[in-house]
Interface confidence: low
C-alpha cells in the first residue's frame, strides 16, 4: 500500500486546512491508527492528534477545539484531519504516521502554507499644489504572506517606487506614487491595486486627487455697451475664475465705497437702475487658501444725451 497526500497544502488565513493522509491498500488491509505531528525546527516534533480505529480522535490539548476529522461519510482508511481557523503560526511542516495491519507503518510529510491576504492602506501625501515639483501623491502599504504585489492604476502621469520590509512570517510592501501636480489632475482617481494569491480578486483603494490652484480672474458684463446706459436695469458684473479649493469672491470699488443699491452675490455684482453715479473702477478680488487674484474694470454709465462717450473695459490682474 501507499499514502496519498500532498506536498503542499495551501489555505487562506482563517479558513480550515485539510491535511490529507489516505491509505491506499489492499482490500484486506486495515488502518489501526494515524498519528499527526507538527515538525518544528525550533520546538521539535509535537503531537497534533491521534486517530485510533477503536478509541476515536484524541487531540493534543494545545490544539483543543482546533483539530477535527472531516465530516461523514468517512472511509476507515482516511486519516485526514481538519485544522480549524488556520493562523500564521500554523504554517510549517506536518507529518502523518499510519499504522496498518498487516502491512506495517507508512509516513508522509507535507508543508502547510497559510496565505495572509493583505489589508492595504492608502495614505495620501501632503497637500498637492500646482507649481510644486515632483511630489508624493499617495503611498499604499500592504502586508501579507507571501509578499503582496502593490501597483497603481491611474491615467495620471507619475512615477512609482516600491520597497518591502520582510518580517519573520510576512512581508510589507509600500509603494509610493509621485507626480508633478497640475490642475488637470483634479478629481482624477489614483487607485492602489494589491494582488495576492490569497485574494480571489485584486483589492483596490481609490484616492481622488485634489490639486490646489487658482486661475487668473476676469470680469464679464461690459461686452454689451447698450446695457450700461442711464436708466437701464439688470446690469451685472460677473467675476470669472476657478480654483481648488473653490475661491471666494469680494467686490470693491477703487474710487470709493460701493454705491447704494449695488448688490454683491458671490461672484456677481448686481446694479439697480443705472445712474452716472455707478461709473467707476470696480475690483473683483478672488482668493482661496493657495493664492489670490484681482481683476478690475472701469464702468462708465453713458447718458443717452451724450452718445459720444464709449464704454472703457480695462482688465488687470
Amino acid at each position: 500500500g501507499e499514502l496519498e497526500t500532498s506536498d503542499v497544502v495551501t489555505v487562506v488565513l482563517g479558513q480550515d486546512a485539510k491535511l490529507p493522509c489516505f491509505y491506499r491498500g489492499d482490500p484486506d488491509e486495515q488502518v489501526g491508527q494515524v498519528a499527526w505531528a507538527r515538525v518544528d525546527p525550533n520546538e521539535g516534533i509535537r503531537e497534533l492528534a491521534l486517530l485510533h480505529s477503536k478509541y476515536g480522535l484524541h487531540v493534543n490539548p494545545a490544539y483543543e477545539d482546533r483539530v477535527e476529522q472531516p465530516p461523514p461519510p468517512r472511509d476507515p482508511l482516511d486519516g485526514s484531519v481538519l485544522l480549524r481557523n488556520a493562523v500564521q503560526a500554523d504554517e510549517g511542516e506536518y507529518e502523518c504516521r499510519v499504522s496498518t495491519f498487516p502491512a506495517g507503518s507508512f509516513q508522509a510529510r507535507m508543508r502547510l502554507r497559510v496565505l495572509v491576504p493583505p489589508l492595504p492602506s492608502l495614505n495620501p501625501g501632503p497637500p498637492l499644489e500646482e507649481g510644486q515639483g515632483l511630489t508624493l501623491a499617495a503611498s499604499c502599504t500592504a502586508e501579507g504572506s507571501p509578499a503582496p504585489s502593490v501597483t497603481w492604476d491611474t491615467e495620471v502621469k507619475g512615477t512609482q517606487s516600491s520597497r518591502s520590509f520582510t518580517h519573520p512570517r510576512s512581508a510589507a510592501v509600500t509603494s509610493e506614487f509621485h507626480l508633478v501636480p497640475s490642475r488637470s489632475m483634479n478629481g482624477q482617481p489614483l487607485t492602489c491595486v494589491v494582488s495576492h494569491p490569497g485574494l480571489l480578486q485584486d483589492r483596490r483603494i481609490t484616492h481622488t486627487l485634489q490639486v490646489a490652484f487658482l486661475a487668473e480672474a476676469s470680469v464679464r458684463g461690459l461686452e454689451d455697451q447698450n446695457l450700461w446706459q442711464v436708466g437701464r436695469e439688470g446690469a451685472t458684473l460677473k467675476c470669472l475664475s476657478e480654483g481648488q479649493p473653490p475661491p471666494k469672491y469680494n467686490w470693491t470699488r477703487l474710487d470709493g465705497p460701493l454705491p447704494s443699491g449695488v448688490r454683491v452675490k458671490g461672484d456677481t455684482l448686481g446694479f439697480p437702475p443705472l445712474t452716472t453715479e455707478h461709473s467707476g473702477v470696480y475690483v473683483c478680488h478672488v482668493s482661496n487658501e493657495l493664492s489670490s487674484r484681482d481683476s478690475q474694470v472701469t464702468v462708465e454709465v453713458l447718458d443717452p444725451e451724450d452718445p459720444g462717450k464709449q464704454v472703457d473695459l480695462v482688465s488687470a490682474s
Epitope: 495614505n123 503611498s139 502599504t141 512615477t159 520597497r163 520590509f165 509610493e176 509621485h178
Partner: antibody, heavy 120, light 111 residues
Framework: EVQLQQSGPDLVKPGASVKISCKAS????????MHWVKQSHGKSLEWIGR????????SYNQKFKDKAILTVDKSSTTAYMELRSLTSEDSAVYYC?????????????WGQGTLVTVSA | DIVLTQSPASLAVSLGQRATISCRAS??????????MHWYQQKPGQPPKLLIK???NLESGVPARFSGSGSGTDFTLNIHPVEEEDTATYYC?????????FGGGTKLEMK
Amino acid sequence: EVQLQQSGPDLVKPGASVKISCKASGYSFTGHYMHWVKQSHGKSLEWIGRVNPNNGGSSYNQKFKDKAILTVDKSSTTAYMELRSLTSEDSAVYYCARDPLGGSYGFAYWGQGTLVTVSA
Amino acid sequence: DIVLTQSPASLAVSLGQRATISCRASQSVTTSSYSYMHWYQQKPGQPPKLLIKYASNLESGVPARFSGSGSGTDFTLNIHPVEEEDTATYYCQHSWEIPYTFGGGTKLEMK
C-alpha cells in the same frame, strides 16, 4: 500642532520594570506609526521598534524583542513602552518619535525624551 | 541589519567655512527614484531634529546652508557657511528596512 509629551524621569532598581508613556496630540493618532528610540549617555541612537496605534501590531529590533513591549491606548492617544528585567545597560534616554510615512521621511516629530536610570 | 558608518567622529570648522560629514551604508539604500537616508541634528539635552530627508530634501524650516547628497551606499551632509548655532552632533539614519539604524554620530565644533 503635533506634540509628543513623554512621562518624567524614572529611577529604578536592577531587575525591575518601567513603563514610559508618550501622549500624542495635534494629529490623527491611529494614522501614524509610533517609534521608540534609545540613546545611552554620550552614545548614538538605537531604534527599538514601532507600534501601529490602529491595531496595536508592533515590530521590534531583534536586539530589544525581549526587553521592550510596545502598546497603545487609542482612547487616550497614548503609546507606552515597558522595559523589563532592567540592568545598568538600560540606563538611557528613551524617545518616542512619529513616523509620517513608514519611515520613508524619517522621524519628523520627537518627544522630549525620558531618562531612565537603573541603579541599586 | 544595515550598518551606517559615519566619518569623521568629530569635526572642528571655522565660522563661515564648509563642514562635510560622510555616512556609508553596508548595503545600498537607494531605489531608482529615491534614497532612504535621512540626517538629524542633535544639541545637548534636546531630541534629534530632522534636517534632510530622502538624502537631499531639506526639511521645512531648516536653513538652506544645510544640504545633502549621495546615493547607493555613500551619503554626505554639507553645512556651508557654518554658523555658531550649528554646534551639535549629526546623525544619519536609514529607513530601507526594519530595523532602522543610525550612524554613530559626528560632533561638530567651532574652531
